[in-house]
Interface confidence: low
C-alpha cells in the first residue's frame, strides 16, 4: 500500500507511516515503528504538557517568584502550568502575570467603584453631589453626605465631594 | 541609598540557637524583600531565606526545619534564627535586600558577620 | 535545585587584559542570571542581573551574556580594583543557588 501522507486525530507522519502522539502530562521518549507503539514517559515533578504532543522534553510548571510580589494561586499538574496570583495589595501587569504592581488608592473626591484584585486594579470613580470623600484609599468608597435633618439639626456648611456637610442647631425663635 | 547595618553575637556554642538582625536605614523596610545569605570560610555563598514585604517567608530546604526569618517593621529591622547550631553552621552571615518587582538580585548587603560555633 | 558550575576556579591575568568568565546552569535558567563581584573582607557587589544588564554604577567594562544553560562576564580591559572573586547566581528556579566562584588574580 501507499505510504499515508496524512494521519488520524492524535496521530502523526513520520518516517512514512502514522505514530500516535503522546497524550497530554506525558513526554515522547521515541516513535512507533513497524513493530513498535509510540513510547512515551509521564512529565516529571514540577513539569508538565497540556496538548496530546510528540514533545521530547516537558515544560517546566511557571515559578511563581516570591521576589516579584507573586504567589502560587493554582499548583500546575502533569497535564496543567502553575497560574500566579499577586500577593494581598498588588495586581498582575499583565495577563500572563509575571509581575506586581502596587493597587491603585482613589484620591479625595474619588471613591472605589470596584476593588483591586489579584489580576486587576483598583476602579476609581467621582464622588457625585450628595457624596464625599476625604481619604486617598483602596477600599473606601464615596460616603454620602450626613443627613442633618434626621439629627434635628440643619446645614450649616454644605458639604463637597472632599468633605462632609458641617450640621448645627437650628435657630430657636425667642419667645 | 537603603543601607543595611547588622548585629549580633559572633560567637556560639552548638545546639544553640543563631540569632542575628538587620536594620534597614535610608529607605522603607516595605516593598522590598529581605533575604538571609552564609558563605562558610573559604568557600560560595548559600541562600538561607527570606521575607518579602508582605511577611511571608521562603526557606532553601536544606534549611528549613531549623530557619526562622521574621522582621519588625516599626523597628525597621529582620532577624535570622538558625536552630541547634553544628560546627558546619559556620559563616559569615549576610543580609541583603531587593526590590520587589525589579527581577535583579541582591541590589544591597548588609556588612556581613562572622559567625563560629565553638564550645 | 539548580546547581550553578563556574570556570575556570582561577584566572591569572595582567592588569589591561581581558577576562572571559563562564557560568553554566544545570537546566535553562532563562535569562535570570546575576553576576556579583566580592573583594576581600566584604558584601559581595551586584554587577550583571537578567544576563545582561548592568547594575547602576558598574563601569561598561563589565558585560553579561547568554541564555538557557550558558552565561559569560566579560571584563573588557581589567583594572586594579578587578581582581576579585566573582560568582554568578540563578533565580529562575527555587532555591536561588550561587555558582562555586571564580577567583580572578594578578598574573
Known amino acids: 500500500p501507499e505510504p499515508p501522507t496524512a494521519c488520524r486525530e492524535k496521530q502523526y507522519l513520520i518516517n512514512s507511516q502514522c505514530c500516535s502522539l503522546c497524550q497530554p502530562g506525558q513526554k515522547l521518549v521515541s516513535d512507533c515503528t513497524e513493530f513498535t507503539e509510540t513510547e512515551c514517559l509521564p512529565c516529571g515533578e514540577s513539569e508538565f504538557l497540556d496538548t496530546w504532543n510528540r514533545e521530547t522534553h516537558c515544560h517546566q510548571h511557571k515559578y511563581c517568584d516570591p521576589n516579584l510580589g507573586l504567589r502560587v494561586q493554582q499548583k500546575g499538574t502533569s497535564e496543567t502550568d502553575t497560574i500566579c496570583t499577586c500577593e494581598e495589595g498588588w495586581h498582575c501587569t499583565s495577563e500572563a502575570c509575571e509581575s506586581c504592581v502596587l493597587h491603585r488608592s482613589c484620591s479625595p473626591g474619588f471613591g472605589v467603584k470596584q476593588i483591586a484584585t489579584g489580576v486587576s486594579d483598583t476602579i476609581c470613580e467621582p464622588c457625585p453631589v450628595g457624596f464625599f470623600s476625604n481619604v486617598s484609599s483602596a477600599f473606601e468608597k464615596c460616603h454620602p453626605w450626613t443627613s442633618c435633618e434626621t439629627k434635628d439639626l440643619v446645614v450649616q456648611q454644605a458639604g463637597t465631594n472632599k468633605t462632609d456637610v458641617v450640621c448645627g442647631p437650628q435657630d430657636r425663635l425667642r419667645a | 541609598q537603603v543601607q543595611l547595618v547588622q548585629s549580633g553575637p559572633g560567637l556560639v556554642k552548638p545546639s544553640e540557637t543563631l540569632s542575628l538582625t538587620c536594620t534597614v536605614s535610608?529607605?522603607?523596610?516595605?516593598?522590598?524583600?529581605w533575604s538571609w545569605i552564609r558563605q562558610p570560610p573559604g568557600k560560595g555563598l548559600e541562600w538561607i531565606g527570606h521575607?518579602?514585604?508582605?511577611?511571608?517567608?521562603n526557606y532553601n530546604p536544606s534549611l528549613k526545619s531549623r530557619v526562622t526569618i521574621s522582621e519588625d517593621t516599626s523597628k525597621k529591622q529582620f532577624s535570622l534564627k538558625l536552630d541547634s547550631v553544628t560546627a558546619a553552621d559556620t559563616a559569615v552571615y549576610y543580609c541583603?535586600?531587593?526590590?520587589?518587582?525589579?527581577?535583579?538580585?541582591?541590589?544591597?548587603w548588609g556588612q556581613g558577620t562572622l559567625v563560629t560555633v565553638s564550645s | 535545585e539548580i546547581v550553578m558550575t563556574q570556570s575556570p576556579a582561577t584566572l591569572s591575568l595582567s592588569p589591561g587584559e581581558r577576562a572571559t568568565l563562564s557560568c553554566r546552569a544545570s537546566?535553562?535558567?532563562?535569562?535570570?542570571l546575576a553576576w556579583y563581584q566580592q573583594k576581600p573582607g566584604q558584601a559581595p557587589r551586584l554587577l550583571i542581573y537578567?544576563?545582561?544588564n548592568r547594575a547602576a554604577d558598574i563601569p561598561a567594562r563589565f558585560s553579561g551574556s547568554g541564555s538557557g544553560t550558558d552565561f559569560t562576564l566579560t571584563i573588557s580591559s581589567l583594572e586594579p580594583e578587578d581582581f576579585a572573586v566573582y560568582y554568578c547566581?540563578?533565580?529562575?528556579?527555587?532555591?536561588?543557588?550561587f555558582g562555586q566562584g571564580t577567583k580572578v588574580e594578578i598574573k
Open positions: 537546566q535553562s535558567v532563562s535569562n535570570n
Open positions: 537578567d544576563a545582561s
Open positions: 535610608g529607605g522603607s523596610i516595605s516593598y522590598y524583600y
Open positions: 547566581q540563578q533565580r529562575n528556579n527555587w532555591p536561588p543557588t
Open positions: 521575607i518579602s514585604y508582605s511577611g511571608s517567608t
Open positions: 541583603a535586600g531587593g526590590i520587589v518587582g525589579a527581577r535583579r538580585g541582591f541590589d544591597f
